[in-house]
């Protein structure tokens, strides 16, 4: 017997659907109507035939009461080929729901997204996460998607993007966006970062994550942030192969005084990089290749320094810096 495609936990909290059949019974998803967090994985199916069954131009207000009754707060949709028109239809209907967090992963969006009709309501998301989503529209995808969202988005995560650079002139500002995560885009690089951080479109960013994004030096990142007018409080550059030295011909970059936390763990560093901010609250240099204890003049003024997992540290030895945090146990790096 084939397993049920959808499973609802006994508390009506989590519902997971895995549609792997070539002709899935989509009505099975109705058991998820009372779940708070819903995950739908479509097994790589092409959802084009859906367009024949639904009227994508129908007024979504007719579904408002039905959709308002959904408890869903967080929705994940994955593994499908989705016509842009169908995506837009879904966003228009979900605008009447309580949905706060939307995750799209392993999707191929085909066709172009129509403009937002004047009478349409945008979706009031606080968090949007995209992983391995490709768009037929290339660089303009963010601007097209943005018009279907209300301006209150707080968290935006874009991983394994096929086009991590945006068409900046079309993108509107994200006034409430406090967290931007571009991690897991190894081809991004510092040039790509400059293209992705559209100047003055991200005025409220506090947390910027750039793990595994092909960054080369902290100074290069500093320059990209300065050019974009982005002043994060927290910057994660972990899991990049960083060079400790700075290109002598490169101009010095002044870090924003707003930056108080910098993560440089798992960065392959053999010495403390040059050009770090002068003062930090938190600096994580764990799981690097530091063969000797950093000298005070190599380090910023820092309250909380983590050096765990570097070769020079023997378990149980004290750290060379006041206020440092060290478990005395070398973590699995």
């Amino acid at each position: 017997t084939t397993p049920e495609p959808c499973e609802l936990d006994d508390e009506d909290f989590r519902c997971v659907c895995n549609f792997s059949e070539p002709q899935p019974d989509w009505s099975e998803a109705f058991q998820c109507v009372s779940a708070v967090e819903v995950e739908i994985h479509a097994g790589g199916l092409n959802l084009e035939p859906f367009l024949k069954r639904v009227d994508a131009d129908a007024d979504p207000r007719q579904y408002a009461d039905t959709v308002k009754a959904l408890r869903v707060r967080r929705l994940t949709v994955g593994a499908a080929q989705v016509p842009a028109q169908l995506l837009v239809g879904a966003l228009r209907v979900l605008a009447y729901s309580r949905l706060k967090e939307l995750t799209l992963e392993d999707l191929k969006i085909t066709g172009t997204m129509p403009p937002l009709p004047l009478e349409a309501t945008g979706l009031a998301l606080s968090s949007l996460r995209l992983r391995n989503v490709s768009w037929a529209t290339g660089r303009s995808w963010l601007a097209e998607l943005q018009q279907w969202l209300k301006p209150g988005l707080k968290v935006l995560s874009i991983a394994q993007a096929h086009s991590p650079a945006f068409s900046c002139e079309q993108v509107r500002a994200f006034p409430a966006l406090t967290s931007l995560d571009l991690s897991d885009n190894p081809g991004l690089g510092e040039r790509g970062l400059m293209a992705a951080l559209c100047p003055h479109k991200f005025p409220a960013i506090q947390n910027l994550a750039l793990r595994n994004t092909g960054m080369e030096t902290p100074t290069g990142v500093c320059a990209a942030l300065a050019a974009a007018g982005v002043q994060p409080h927290s910057l994660d550059l972990s899991h990049n192969s960083l060079r400790a030295t700075v290109n002598p011909s490169a101009p010095r970059c002044m870090w924003s005084s707003a930056l108080n936390s910098l993560n440089l763990s798992f960065a392959g560093l053999e010495q403390v990089p040059k050009g770090l901010p002068a003062k930090l609250r938190v600096l994580d240099l764990s799981c690097n290749r530091l063969n000797r204890a950093p000298q005070p003049d190599e380090l910023p003024e820092v309250d909380n320094l983590t050096l765990d997992g570097n070769p020079f540290l023997v378990p149980g030895t004290a750290l060379p810096h006041e206020g440092s945090m060290n478990s005395g146990v070398v973590p699995a790096c």
Partner: antibody, heavy 115, light 111 residues
Amino acid sequence: QVQLQESGPGLVKPSQTLSLTCTVSGYSITSDSAWNWIRQPPGKGLEWIGYISYSGSTSYNPSLKSRVTISRDTSKNQFSLKLSSVTAADTAVYYCVRGLRFAYWGQGTLVTVSS
Amino acid sequence: DIVLTQSPDSLAVSLGERATINCRASESVDSYVNSFLHWYQQKPGQPPKLLIYRASNLQSGVPDRFSGSGSRTDFTLTISSLQAEDVAVYYCQQSNEDPYTFGQGTKLEIK
């Protein structure tokens, strides 16, 4: 059988941050469900503070949202509450609770806000 | 926010008699076929204990003298034959919509 146990200081000074941890045994906090904090001022009713879900998603009571952070440490199977800028009105028994129909409760810990 | 109002605030019932507590919601707590309204019992110095979930389902281990009914905005907890150990404060709670809210409580005593 899932068990929850709150821990943290019983006395916090006004304007400081209240920090509590809930240790969960018999169930993984990443497998499903919502992991909540609920409080009860002495002699009063119950107030939901917020939750962190199995996925790491959080939801907070709007009346406390600006002061609350709920986080988790999956390696220790723990979730934590931080409530900043506390006043005497935050004196209460704080419970950690599993689910949205609150079937599993910790014993609760009394936190007094006083100088 | 959904406001839950319990009535009465306190109740005195003779042993063996029926006790009824009402809970009214400021808006519907139903989502499709389910009513996300639950009932709890709290004794002094203890955390609340779930009695009834989704309006009418008896939680495992709870005596069957406890029952719940209702839908949308009006709900009732009934104790068919009051026992001495049922003296406690009873709360209703909704989980249809955040913030998840409780009623103000009903104190049940023996007459």
